[in-house]
Amino acid sequence: GITIPRNPGCPNSEDKNFPRTVMVNLNIHNRNTNTNPKRSSDYYNRSTSPWNLHRNEDPERYPSVIWEAKCRHLGCINADGNVDYHMNSVPIQQEILVLRREPPHCPNSFRLEKILVSVGCTCVTPIVHHVA
Amino acid sequence: GITIPRNPGCPNSEDKNFPRTVMVNLNIHNRNTNTNPKRSSDYYNRSTSPWNLHRNEDPERYPSVIWEAKCRHLGCINADGNVDYHMNSVPIQQEILVLRREPPHCPNSFRLEKILVSVGCTCVTPIVHHVA
């Protein structure tokens, strides 16, 4: 394996809970700048499995506002603009990492938390269960 | 806005960069359990806008390996199983938080970073530009 030497300038942790509790710089670096000039925010309307976005707010969490996708229909929109129930609109779900204040209401102490969010919807062929 | 009083049991931060640098408990709590009984991981194959997963690795980041969705086709799969180029397969993107070692190779000091990942694809009606 690749062996990377420890940086001699690393901060020491005197915390008795180390390594469970570490220092994290919250000056969030955004690597997304200009990565995708074609990124579109209107797919939720143009998709054959369109979705609505619902606001979920929690002041004890970072990010405090998360927008969740909810598929508009059980089926998918066909070429005529009608809902085709032979196909299914399903949410694409993704686990994301958030920070939760712990203990609650503390401005400088957090815990990492994994939550499941629906990002958008896609149209899939249904799984048909044949009854014997 | 709602004013939440500061918890008197909060840890103090002596760090000169406070509140940019905070204490984070790395014992990741999973809030997903039992939230979604219908969660499926095979949509990437069953979608009318199917996708493949491509590996991106960075040992200084957690998670170090990120599999990104890349749509298989420009068009979408129709009822006959053929690609219909009158529709477009497009990636659904999501901003996620990752942790980066900072300074590099330090085991107990991190920085939060936001990156944009493609988590799946959806089928959309194309935007048609009419030439005058």
Partner: antibody, heavy 126, light 107 residues
Framework: EVQLVQSGAEVKKPGSSVKVSCKAS????????ISWVRQAPGQGLEWVGG????????DYAQKFQGRVTITADESTTTAYMELSGLTSDDTAVYYC???????????????????WGQGTTVTVSS | EIVLTQSPDFRSVTPKEKVTITCRAS??????LHWYQQKPDQSPKLLIK???HSISGVPSRFSGSGSGTDFTLTINGLEAEDAGTYYC?????????FGQGTKVDIK
Amino acid sequence: EVQLVQSGAEVKKPGSSVKVSCKASGGSFTSYGISWVRQAPGQGLEWVGGITTFFGVADYAQKFQGRVTITADESTTTAYMELSGLTSDDTAVYYCARDPHEFWNGYYATHDFDYWGQGTTVTVSS
Amino acid sequence: EIVLTQSPDFRSVTPKEKVTITCRASQNIGSALHWYQQKPDQSPKLLIKYASHSISGVPSRFSGSGSGTDFTLTINGLEAEDAGTYYCHQSDDLPYTFGQGTKVDIK
């Protein structure tokens, strides 16, 4: 190619401790976790605990809490499992396994054990 | 903790036969269920991850299905080399747990 090579068999007295090592090669050590799984003679598999090498943070099964310590040394790409207060019930083959922790298909960090060490037999006998 | 119950405990089969092993979780685990094969005196080997995803190098006769609480491992056309014990494993929540195992031998 990923390889996990474990230390040799150990014979220990009741009440003593054992420390088993798992040397990883192939790929970046901090890109995945290492879990420890044991198998008593003629029995099934039992998860002991695991470590996220990127953070150096370990999680343990409640059953072993307080007498197991899992650590990782990045400089030698080696993980260790130390079990104390040994009894005859701890006689087993101890395996290390790679825990991928990959952002994949809706999961922030996957936890299937894709590569395994060859196993270390620990015998506890007076 | 999440309990995984496999059935059957033991199966004796003839080559080319189809083998089905089930694994039931005591609570919903989504798709976080994996299958391993262990041959005598060998380490376990990952066969299927996340309920239905095949692993590179594993023969295509091995397949998995299910989600929530009920999962199935299928061996389509068993071969002599498939003799061994099969385990399911959940990674939805700590502590990770395994099924008790299903031993498959060849008649």
